[in-house]
């Protein structure tokens, strides 16, 4: 007789997720030579401990304290890049300004980019099927969790002039609710940030409205000053010549506005 | 953390007062103006940011005017068109750490009437 | 806007009683809130920032709790010198505000 399980609104465990981790792990590890002292099994046994046997809306950040612990890894503090709603843009940003990082340019970050997990209380099985979803069914969830954690540390860490992209195609250009807007603002360090820069990517040719002014954005800029950090903020109207200027800065084309 | 003194003023007045700090930098922490009526609770009026930015409460938008001088030390207030209701002690404050106003100035009268 | 309400208006306790005073935010404030005691004719003193924290060299006594949109400053085993009247303020953002203080509790204690 199948023992009864629980049923969740979210997707469940991504497939081959323990083979993803580890394989992940395994390319991470040879490709950033700081890192070469990690072993991933370690890594996978700690992070398999913060969710297995567990119920998946009782996850705490404790529980991620061990894989913290072994993914401990230094970043350039001033050469951080945030984002919100914009991911795939800041990763192509990073994978060309070689010497600012994401979160998921770190290996914690890296290790669950895209994937979702969760177990069952008392028993050692991964849950395929389904997990919770944030909203529907609950915030202590293991991938809600895992963000918030590494985002917290990931914040915590930064200094001088921090860097986030923001989607200016969105209604809201800075969410409240956001991993950005609900943890890694909050965690900014006011002794070490000096700055908070600000790219509003824009999303149509034609739109050359300055999405600096944005309620939402002069909200952000208000909720940053209270933490007595300052604040900058820059449109970036063609986010494709945007890119190309990274790759090839001397290009002619590149001193206009972008 | 210390405010210029107050004094009596007409309705219809132009209020200018200065606020002196030392011992912190303004490009380091805020400045929060804050009045106090007499018997009555707290009143936030508005806050001059490290990058120099200003905020105010929706009442005081029209009529106030805060500004800075990071070689003095200096925060001003500039409040027009006073009323009787402007009667207050005016508070300079530190914006400190998490926003919090840690550091208050004693305080100065002012007295808007006819 | 970031309203606050706090309750009660006023409240007395007896020596060695507890106060509890709360303070509601009217959208979430993310634990930006700091709690000020005031006595008359001085300016309120930092008790607690961040929610929580307590400030340099305030007594234990003093205790803040809450997240959100629901915070409360409790006063343990009250004692004369705690008479006066105790403020909240949102700390989160300084724009679109009517006012960032609650309207303040008066402590008597008998």
């Known amino acids: 007789v199948p023992r009864w399980r629980q049923q969740w609104s979210g997707p469940g465990t991504t497939k081959r997720f323990p083979e993803t981790v580890l394989a992940r792990c395994v390319k991470y590890t040879e490709i950033h030579p700081e890192m070469r002292h990690v072993d991933c099994q370690s890594v996978w046994d700690a992070f398999k401990g913060a969710f297995i046997s567990k119920h998946p809306c009782n996850i705490t950040e404790e529980d991620y304290q061990p894989l913290m612990k072994l993914g401990t890894q230094t970043v350039p503090c001033n050469k951080i890049l945030l984002w919100s709603r914009i991911k795939d843009l800041a990763h192509q940003f990073t994978q060309v300004q070689r010497d600012m990082f994401t979160l998921e340019d770190t290996l914690l970050g890296y290790l669950a980019d895209d994937l979702t997990w969760c177990g069952e209380f008392n028993t050692s099985k991964i849950n395929y099927q389904s997990c919770p979803d944030w909203r529907k069914d609950c915030s202590n969830n293991p991938v809600s969790v895992f963000w918030k954690t590494v985002s917290r540390r990931f914040a915590e860490a930064a200094c001088d002039v921090v860097h986030v992209m923001l989607n200016g195609s969105r209604s809201k250009i800075f969410d409240k609710n956001s991993t950005f807007g609900s943890v890694e603002v909050h965690n900014l360090q006011p002794e070490k940030v000096q700055t908070l820069e600000a790219w509003v990517i824009h999303g149509g040719r034609e739109d050359s409205r300055d999405l600096c002014q944005d309620p939402t954005i002069k909200e952000l800029e208000s909720i940053i000053s209270k933490r007595n950090i300052q604040f900058s903020c820059k449109n970036i109207y063609r986010p494709d010549k945007f890119l190309q200027c990274v790759k090839n800065p001397e290009d002619s084309s590149c001193t206009s506005e972008i | 953390v210390k405010e210029s003194e107050g004094g009596l003023f007409k309705p219809t007045d132009t209020l200018t007062l200065t606020c002196t700090v030392s011992g912190f930098s303004l490009s380091s922490y805020g400045v929060i103006w804050v009045r106090q009526a007499p018997g009555k609770g707290l009143e936030y009026i508005g806050f001059?940011?490290?990058?120099?930015?200003?905020y105010y409460a929706n009442w005081a938008k029209s009529r106030s005017t805060i500004t800075r001088n990071t070689n003095e030390n200096t925060v001003t207030l500039k409040m027009t068109s006073l009323t009787a209701a402007d009667t207050a002690t005016y508070f300079c404050v530190r914006n400190g750490v998490s926003g919090s106003s840690d550091i208050w100035g004693p305080g100065t009268l002012v007295t808007v009437s006819s | 806007a970031y309203d606050m309400t706090q309750t009660p208006a006023s409240v007395s306790e007896p020596v060695g009683g507890t106060v509890t005073i709360k303070c509601q935010a009217s959208?979430?404030?993310?634990?930006?809130l700091s709690w000020y005691q005031q006595k008359l004719g001085q300016p309120p003193k930092l008790l607690i920032y961040s929610a929580s924290t307590l400030a340099s060299g305030v007594s234990s006594r003093f205790k803040g709790s809450g997240s959100g949109t629901e915070y409360t400053l409790t006063i343990s085993g009250v004692e004369c010198a705690d008479a006066a009247t105790y403020y909240c303020q949102q700390d989160y953002s300084g724009s679109n505000v009517d006012n960032t203080f609650g309207g303040g509790t008066e402590v008597v204690v008998k």
């Open positions: 959208q979430s404030i993310y634990s930006y």
């Open positions: 001059v940011a490290v990058g120099g930015t200003t």
